[in-house]
């Protein structure tokens, strides 16, 4: 790496992946192993995070970017930069202090994380329940009861396709 020639700050030309080495007359030196600099002009390289223990490596550290961690199988990340791991549950469950518990009746969870949420109340939108909810799935709301003529199916059939140039009868 050449010595930089900037008149203002000789370190400003040191690119990412290097640091401005005061011990070597401000020459741009490459980051040592297991360290990185993600921006130019840095006077030190940061030590890479190690994904050990409850964490595993999702992306290796390079000279210009830090390592990225995720959690071991059966767990998912929480917090900025995956600072914590939380146990996965099955769909239809939520994590409590005592472990994974089934969603109570009237609630659902369609993911392996998070909490059980109440089924949608179709009647609040003036609609009816088209498909019942389960522990894993929300209800599906359909047309309002008033939209259905007596004896008509709650599932509206598709309108027939009209040919161009023909006005409706």
């Amino acid at each position: 790496f050449e010595r930089t020639r900037s008149l203002q700050d000789p370190c400003s030309n040191c690119p990412a992946g290097t640091f401005c080495d005061n011990n070597r007359n401000q020459i741009c030196s490459p980051c040592p192993p297991n360290s990185f600099s993600s921006a130019g002009g840095q006077r030190t390289c940061d030590i890479c995070r190690q994904c050990k223990g409850v964490f595993r490596t999702r992306k290796e550290c390079s000279s210009t970017s830090n390592a990225e961690c995720d959690c071991t199988p059966g767990f998912h990340c929480l917090g900025a930069g995956c600072s914590m791991c939380e146990q996965d549950c099955k769909q239809g469950q939520e994590l409590t202090k005592k472990g994974c518990k089934d969603c109570c009746f009237g609630t659902f969870n369609d993911q392996k994380r998070g909490i059980c949420r109440p089924w949608t109340n179709c009647s609040l939108d003036g609609k009816s329940v088209l498909v019942n909810g389960t522990k894993e799935r929300d209800v599906v709301c359909g047309p309002s009861p008033a939209d259905l003529s007596p004896g008509a199916s709650s599932v509206t059939p598709p309108a027939p396709a009209r040919e161009p140039g023909h006005s409706p009868q």
Epitope: G53, V54, A80, M84, C85
Partner: antibody, heavy 118, light 107 residues
Framework: QVQLKQSGPGLVQPSQSLSITCTVS????????VHWVRQSPGKGLEWLGA???????DYSAAFMSRVTINKDNSKSQVFFKMNSLRPDDTAIYYC????????????WGQGTSVTVSS | DIQMTQSPASLSASVGETVTITCRAS??????LAWYQQKQGKSPQLLVY???TLADGVPSRFSGSGSGTQYSLKINSLQPEDFGSYYC?????????FGGGTKLEIK
Amino acid sequence: QVQLKQSGPGLVQPSQSLSITCTVSGFSLTNYGVHWVRQSPGKGLEWLGAIWSGGNTDYSAAFMSRVTINKDNSKSQVFFKMNSLRPDDTAIYYCARNPYYTNVMDYWGQGTSVTVSS
Amino acid sequence: DIQMTQSPASLSASVGETVTITCRASGNIGNFLAWYQQKQGKSPQLLVYNGETLADGVPSRFSGSGSGTQYSLKINSLQPEDFGSYYCQHFWSTPWTFGGGTKLEIK
């Protein structure tokens, strides 16, 4: 409740090896890691190494050539061995649990006081 | 290796006072910092992890804060049972080193 109980000798001859057993209860070693730390008047608290739920280990580079950590999940026991002891290895040696949610030491054993002397 | 520098090394305070202990890392440790309390003749006990999260059962008068390389542990309204030694430890990259400790004594 969670407990870590340590057993091991109090006195070790120089150049001999140290073996400590950490017997855990209230949790399973298949789900939790265990660290080993020592505390000496001269050097304070030092992390020595850890064994993880899957059986893989990490060691401090300063002790890698002398320390071995193993475990027996079925007996809920973790085994710590350090070779070629010197007088400056005199310290209290602790095992400590690593929780499942992040890397930290949330429960500690009572400690094993080790003196290296002839 | 990342070095942890803790200050002050010792501290005298009275019951009811507020004290702050600081820990400086030699490099960025991204909030992967724990604080432990140790009473004379006992094993360390976890107080705070990830810089600011209180461990289960730890009184709310304890609080952790900080980012990057600078971290602190604050104890509001000191109680008699709070006197002892305090240590920080990082979990960024091995070896997971500890600070030198702060001995909190009763005035």
